[in-house]
Interface confidence: medium
């Protein structure tokens, strides 16, 4: 019995659902009573899901798997794995037994995009040419391990004094911390690029250091020039710093964070005390760092509604303020492709191909092309609907007249994460049915 699975690994984003495709060719007169289907982990032989004696025997894998019962009779033995975790990564074997027996293994590659790196300097004040500075580039919650590249403002790679560490959290996602030690020139730009090798996603940030003393007078409040990009559900740090003078004590400090547009209070520190969060109890300061001039705000469990500008007001004897932008993002899932009609297809038939990608933010850009890279723009209709959390589901519909065979691929781009997710469907045969039976 010939059992067919994709040659390439199935790539799934953490938290999304993945379909491990597996198909066989049922003979005429085939009934489900004859079918024994077993999905198991290839290496450990642990049972994942089974179908026997005409019945779905259910999930043996944390209740996160399902078959496609309506499609089994047509030879579709695919497995749906829900809420993918890093620990799911590996090889799954699909065993099919009717009268004969066949099996094939499909690889699941798990991935998670890295956040836009945050850059910190140590020391971060009173810098002079010739000083040695440690620049730390941190990027969070990605998988698999990242590649990190440093370069200067002219694109020259900086490889000499770089130390990169990657620590996995309980979910197996990596936080990357890359440290560059440099001797300052008159001024310099240093950029760090964090690449996810599976998603081919690049996240990068730069810091420009101009070593000079701050002018006296008003408090100089420093925030990042670029928006802080945060993934929905993760925590974000809105960086804000000031330079305390010798003898400064927290009793002198008034710190207020507020929404720039509405002036709504977010968090404050006055009279030597943290006054707490006025923003849904999801904000916190860094109390141990305030005395050193770190007025940054931690925003927890970021939501789409948090996007916008936050102002950091610092008053000691003098007063200063600066605004930092928060850009919220969520990666789009790997597109699922559906055909209508999906069986008995012949050259000349008009087919509607739907490409669906879920729970991304902000709105996506969608591009279609054929198997030779030719863009398909004629009969495309794309709709994007936001759910209650403000995340978008994208549905792009392409109407095509079939040739003898053809590949149609859809690319869904997240313009903020510069993350591309793409799906393809290949229509072959004459006549044929989708999904392919063999």
């Amino acid at each position: 019995l010939e059992v067919q699975v994709p040659e390439d690994p199935v790539v799934a984003l953490v938290g999304t659902d993945a379909t491990l495709c597996c198909s066989f060719s049922p003979e005429p007169g085939f009934s489900l009573a004859q079918l024994n289907l077993i999905w198991q982990l290839t290496d450990t032989k642990q049972l994942v899901h089974s179908f026997a004696e005409g019945q779905d025997q259910g999930s043996a894998y944390a209740n996160r798997t399902a078959l496609f019962p309506d499609l089994l009779a047509q030879g579709n033995a695919s497995l749906r794995l829900q809420r993918v975790r890093v620990a799911d990564e590996g090889s799954f074997t699909c065993f099919v037994s009717i009268r004969d027996f066949g099996s094939a293994a499909v690889s699941l590659q798990v991935a998670a995009p890295y956040s836009k790196p945050s850059m910190t300097l140590e020391p971060n004040k009173d810098l002079r040419p010739g000083d040695t500075v440690t620049i730390t580039c941190s990027s969070y919650q990605g998988y698999p391990e990242a590649e990190v590249f440093w370069q200067d403002g002219q694109g020259v790679p900086l490889t000499g004094n770089v130390t990169t560490s990657q620590m996995a959290n309980e979910q197996g996602l990596f936080d990357v911390h890359s440290i560059l030690r440099v001797v300052l020139g008159a001024n310099g730009t240093y950029s760090c690029l964090v690449r996810n090798p599976v998603l081919q996603q690049d996240a990068h940030s730069s810091v420009t250091i101009t070593p000079q003393r701050s002018p006296t007078g008003a408090v100089e409040v420093q925030v990042p020039e670029d928006p802080v990009v945060a993934l929905v559900g993760t925590d974000a740090t809105l960086r804000c710093s000031f330079s305390p003078e010798p003898g400064f004590s927290l009793a002198q400090l008034n710190l207020i964070w507020q929404l720039t547009d509405t002036k709504q209070l977010v968090h404050s520190f006055t009279e030597g005390r943290d006054q707490g969060s006025a923003y849904a109890n999801r904000t916190a300061l860094f109390p141990d760092l305030l005395a050193q001039g770190n007025a940054s705000l931690r925003l927890q469990r970021v939501r789409v509604a948090d996007e916008g500008s936050f102002t950091c007001f610092v008053s000691i004897r003098d007063f200063g303020s600066a605004a930092v932008s928060l850009q919220v993002a969520a990666p789009y899932s790997k597109p699922s492709m559906t055909l209508e009609p999906n069986k008995d297809l012949r050259p000349g038939d008009t087919v509607t191909i739907t490409c669906s990608s879920y729970r991304g933010y902000p709105e996506a850009e969608v591009f279609w092309q054929d198997g030779q890279g030719v863009p398909l723009t004629g009969n495309v209709t794309t709709s994007q609907m936001a759910n209650e959390q403000g995340l978008f589901d994208v549905h792009s519909v392409l109407r095509v007249v079939l040739g003898a065979n053809g590949t149609y691929s859809c690319l869904v781009r997240n313009p903020v994460l510069q993350q591309d997710a793409h799906g393809s469907v290949t229509i072959t045969g004459q006549p044929m049915t989708f999904p392919p039976e063999a």
């Epitope: 690049d202 850009e365 591009f367 092309q369 198997g371 030779q372 890279g373 030719v374 863009p375 723009t377 040739g403 003898a404 590949t407 691929s409 690319l411 781009r413 313009p415 591309d420 793409h422 393809s424």
Partner: antibody, heavy 121, light 106 residues
Framework: EVQLVQSGAEVKKPGSSVKVSCKAS????????IHWVRQAPGQGLEWMGY????????DYAQKFQGRVTLTADKSTSTAYMELSSLRSEDTAVYYC??????????????WGQGTTVTVSS | EIVLTQSPDFQSVTPKEKVTITCRAS?????MNWYQQKPDQSPKLLIK???NLASGVPSRFSGSGSGTDFTLTINSLEAEDAATYYC?????????FGQGTKLEIK
């Protein structure tokens, strides 16, 4: 070695037609589209159209619709570009190029050496 | 059609200088390719898919950008880089090139 070799220079009268050939070697001719790009003296690159040698599907830039015909001969791995109703503004170097890559990223990785077409009375 | 506008049209630069050429698309594109053309030669692929160096291209060339704004950067220009540079997209029909940026070495 992957290469595209084009036919030699042509001098044509206004109103006539020209047919330029582009012979592919070193790869599977039917696996990639062949595009035609022209460049008038001192000017930039201008896309004319492409042909899929396998399906023989073609698409042309609107400017050349009705005047250009792209064909391909699988047996000889050769693509052809025929431009009719020539005028002096069609004097240019004509390039064929292979559009390569894989979903979703594609690019012209191999170019012919160019064929100079001069239209003059 | 998507119009690609390069700037500058012409630049005269000295060796070792850093050069930045920008390409702005009239609508968002999925990626950008860059080509180099020297006098009396065919164009040559330089950067593919926005930021990936083509085979054999020196590392002083780099590409970046997304959406509608893309950049080709040459760090520490060399005499052999005198050429015309073109950006190209095919996210939607027709395929278009930028008008070209000519680099002259002083």
């Amino acid at each position: 070695e992957v290469q595209l070799v084009q036919s030699g220079a042509e001098v044509k009268k206004p109103g006539s037609s020209v047919k330029v050939s582009c012979k592919a070697s070193g790869y599977s001719f039917t696996s990639y589209t062949i595009h035609w790009v022209r460049q008038a003296p001192g000017q930039g690159l201008e896309w004319m159209g492409y042909i899929n040698p396998n399906s023989r599907n073609t698409d042309y830039a609107q400017k050349f619709q009705g005047r250009v015909t792209l064909t391909a001969d699988k047996s000889t791995s050769t693509a052809y570009m025929e431009l009719s109703s020539l005028r002096s503004e069609d004097t240019a170097v004509y390039y064929c190029a292979r559009y390569s890559g894989s979903t979703p990223y594609w690019y012209f990785d191999v170019w012919g050496q160019g064929t100079t077409v001069t239209v003059s009375s | 059609e998507i119009v690609l506008t390069q700037s500058p049209d012409f630049q005269s630069v000295t060796p070792k200088e850093k050069v930045t050429i920008t390409c702005r698309a009239s609508s968002s594109v999925s990626y950008m390719n860059w080509y180099q053309q020297k006098p009396d030669q065919s164009p040559k692929l330089l950067i593919k898919a926005t930021s990936n160096l083509a085979s054999g291209v020196p590392s002083r060339f780099s590409g970046s950008g997304s959406g509608t704004d893309f950049t080709l950067t040459i760090n520490s220009l060399e005499a052999e880089d005198a050429a015309t540079y073109y950006c190209q997209q095919w996210s939607s029909n027709p395929l278009t090139f930028g008008q070209g940026t000519k680099l002259e070495i002083k």
